[in-house]
């Protein structure tokens, strides 16, 4: 059988035709034994016979050597056709009657048996000398996956007979195995794009297209690497793969020029304390380059514009930062900027943030403690310390008194309203020591406790010593 190098020279779309093998008598009608669903196909011209894998009869008589070996007749060899066309081909074999045991013909492609939904059919033409068998195979709409080497196999007297291969080449438009990928590049910096496509038919030639215009006037054989010297603005690239069937165009990929990010938006203060603010923001467009870090700038809003700016750097994610070490009850202006590999974004619009009142920094002064035996109370007095505006509005005082006697200890506290400067505390135990400390409470929180003042509480008898006290700062007089 000849091979057809020229496209579709074999005429695979034609029906099977030609004389039946073995010069069968006209009155012998074929028997059909389909392998699977398929059209009934008429037998094909099979060409000249020559042995492929052959079988000889298993006989002991000397006559067995005179019998011809069994072999498939020569196949068509090679079929070249276009995608989506139909193709039909066959194998044929003559089995003399001396061969008692034969199995059906099976079709194999690239070493694997074809089972199931393939359109194959077997025709039997018996006569006095034996039987001619034709195995017919058809594919209604060929695809690239049908490319390959097809063979017939048959078992004759436990020997496997194999036909010559039928090579099917399905030709179509080029098929991309590698398409260009979108990249983000630095302005005026070289970069590469890659494109690869295959046939058949080969060769496949590549043209590059930038913004709908060809880059190269002469094609490059696939695969092709396009080196772009540099871009100053966004461009769309694609590649065209050309072969003798036509051309296929890859997806268009956008090549973006990296720029500085856009400024962050939606800067908010999520939470404020006396000395910190929690800042959140939404990152702006990243400029086609990942954000690396962000900068939060804070300045006192009440000062003139030349006031010093505090800068706090943080990672780009999460989009949240707690600015600490701020003054209480103060107003600040806040802005955020982020950077990528190209540079820093412009700053976001400044927003106002305020810290809350702080806890007072001073303790009450001039604390005195006096035991009133008649009422069995401790009388405690103090003077209000100087409280700054940022310490917050005075709410009251907290009095801590700890009682200790013979290994037992009891800690109690009282709160008194802002107007008071004295308090009475019931005696909790006798023959004990009471330690008193007082702290200022403002809306900003509780301040530090004063230095402790100790009072000795005797058995139920008169107190014969002066009251305990803490002097005001700078005052060394005993009370």
């Amino acid at each position: 059988g000849g091979t057809a190098e020229k496209e579709e020279e074999i005429k695979p779309d034609q029906p099977f035709s030609g004389p039946l093998p073995g010069s069968l008598p006209a009155d012998h009608r074929p028997f059909f034994a389909p392998h699977s669903s398929g059209d009934q196909l008429s037998p094909s011209q099979t060409g000249r016979s020559h042995p492929a894998h052959t079988a000889t009869p298993q006989m002991t008589s000397a006559a067995s050597n005179l019998l011809p070996p069994v072999a498939f007749k020569n196949t068509i060899g090679r079929i070249v056709l276009s995608e989506h066309k139909s193709v039909k081909f066959n194998c044929s074999i003559n089995i003399p009657n001396v061969y008692q045991e034969t199995a059906g013909i099976s079709w194999w492609k690239d070493g694997k048996e074809l089972l199931g939904a393939h359109h194959s059919i077997t025709q039997f033409y018996p006569d006095e000398e034996g039987v001619s068998i034709i195995a017919l195979f058809s594919i209604t709409s060929v695809q690239r996956s049908d490319n390959g080497s097809y063979i017939c196999k048959m078992k004759v007297n436990d020997r496997e007979v194999v036909s010559d291969p039928i090579y099917v080449e399905v030709q179509g438009l080029p098929y991309f195995t590698k398409q260009p990928e979108s990249v983000n590049v630095t302005r005026n910096t070289a970069f590469n794009l890659t494109c690869q496509a295959v046939g058949p038919p080969e060769p496949v030639n590549i043209f590059w297209v930038q913004n709908s215009s060809r880059v190269n006037e002469n094609p490059e054989r696939s695969p092709s690497v396009l080196t772009v010297a540099g871009l100053t603005e966004t461009a769309v690239f694609s590649c065209e793969a050309h072969n003798d069937k036509g051309l296929t165009v890859s997806k268009g990929v956008q090549i973006n020029i990296k720029v500085i990010p856009s400024p962050p938006t939606e800067v908010h203060i999520l939470n404020s304390t006396a000395h910190s603010i929690l800042v959140s923001w939404v990152p702006g467009f990243d400029g086609y380059s990942p954000l690396q870090n962000c900068s939060i700038q804070v300045k006192e809003a009440d000062q003139l514009s030349n006031g010093s700016v505090m800068v706090f750097n943080t990672s780009a994610s999460p989009h949240l930062y707690e600015v600490q070490q701020l003054q209480a009850l103060a107003n600040y202006s806040v802005t955020v900027s982020c950077r990528n590999e190209i540079g820093w974004s412009a700053v976001s619009p400044w927003i106002l943030a305020s810290t809350t009142e702080g806890a007072p920094a001073v303790a009450p002064l001039n604390i005195t403690v006096f035991l009133n035996e008649s009422s069995n109370n401790l009388e405690i007095r103090w003077t209000k310390p100087p409280i700054k505006r940022q310490d917050g509005e005075l709410v009251g005082y907290r009095i801590s008194h700890v009682w200790e006697s013979a290994g037992t200890s009891k800690e109690l506290s009282e709160e008194v309203s802002q107007n008071g400067s004295w308090a009475q505390v019931p005696v909790q135990m006798h023959n004990a020591t009471c330690t008193v400390r007082i702290a200022v409470i403002t809306k900003g929180g509780i301040g530090p406790f004063s230095e402790p003042v100790d009072v000795a509480i005797p058995e139920h008898s008169r107190v014969d010593y002066a009251p305990s006290s803490t002097p005001a700062p700078g005052n060394t007089e005993s009370m």
Partner: antibody, heavy 122, light 107 residues
Framework: EVQLVESGGGLVQPKGSLKLSCAAS????????MHWVRQAPGEGLEWVAR??????????NYADSVKDRFTISRDDSQSMLYLQMNNLQTEDTAIYYC?????????????WGQGTSVTVSS | DIQMTQTTSSLSASLGDRVTISCRAS??????LNWYQQKLDGTVKLLIY???RLHSGVPSRFSGSGSGTDYSLTISNLEQEDIATYFC?????????FGGGTKLEIK
């Protein structure tokens, strides 16, 4: 100046054969792909066949309507293009143009002959 | 196969007019669209290739545009010698196919 001159047209009976020729001059014939295009009376243009240059192994393409009946060939030494037409049918009646492919992979037919008339009739 | 459609089969215009002839492909042909002029004597000439490139020797009053599936040929200032039939053709894949033609006549 590019010149393409067709010949070989005429009257032929259905199922008959005819061979068209095209003599090319004024350009380097062997580097160009060549085509045949036809136009039936009162109809539009119909591409028929292409043959590529030697560098592309003389690969051929055909319209489905003529596949297996027509064969395109060339003789670079003589700067000749041929179209062998077998099993002609009445619908093959047309003016047949020999055409040069503009190349550079733009797939445009840049120079056309004046055409030769083929009539298939009994 | 790719179908090429020229919806207007004939067109009347006056000398000096701006004339546009359109052509539509049944699928994206990626600018592989060519325009031809056929005179009454049967002579065929290439005018525009690759959608918008002017073939050598063609007057600049001819221009082509389009992309994807829709293309057009424009004659900016119609002259007597432009009276002809105009065909579009796709070269993206075989078989190459032509539009049905648009016959341009003088009013």
């Amino acid at each position: 100046e590019v010149q393409l001159v067709e010949s070989g047209g005429g009257l032929v009976q259905p199922k008959g054969s005819l061979k068209l020729s095209c003599a090319a001059s004024g350009f380097t014939f062997n580097v160009y792909d060549m085509h045949w295009v036809r136009q039936a009376p009162g109809e539009g243009l119909e591409w028929v066949a292409r043959i590529r240059s030697k560098s592309s192994n003389y690969a051929t393409n055909y319209a489905d309507s003529v596949k297996d009946r027509f064969t395109i060939s060339r003789d670079d030494s003589q700067s000749m293009l041929y179209l062998q037409m077998n099993n002609l049918q009445t619908e093959d009646t047309a003016i047949y143009y020999c055409v040069r492919d503009g190349s550079h992979y733009y797939y445009a037919l840049d120079y056309w002959g004046q055409g030769t008339s083929v009539t298939v009739s009994s | 196969d790719i179908q090429m459609t020229q919806t207007t089969s004939s067109l009347s215009a006056s000398l000096g007019d701006r004339v546009t002839i359109s052509c539509r492909a049944s699928q994206d042909i990626n600018n592989y669209l060519n325009w031809y002029q056929q005179k009454l004597d049967g002579t065929v000439k290439l005018l525009i290739y690759y959608s918008s490139r002017l073939h050598s020797g063609v007057p600049s009053r001819f221009s082509g545009s389009g992309s994807g599936t829709d293309y057009s040929l424009t004659i900016s200032n119609l002259e007597q010698e432009d009276i002809a039939t105009y065909f579009c053709q796709q070269g993206k894949m075989f078989p190459w196919t032509f539009g049905g033609g648009t016959k341009l006549e003088i009013k």
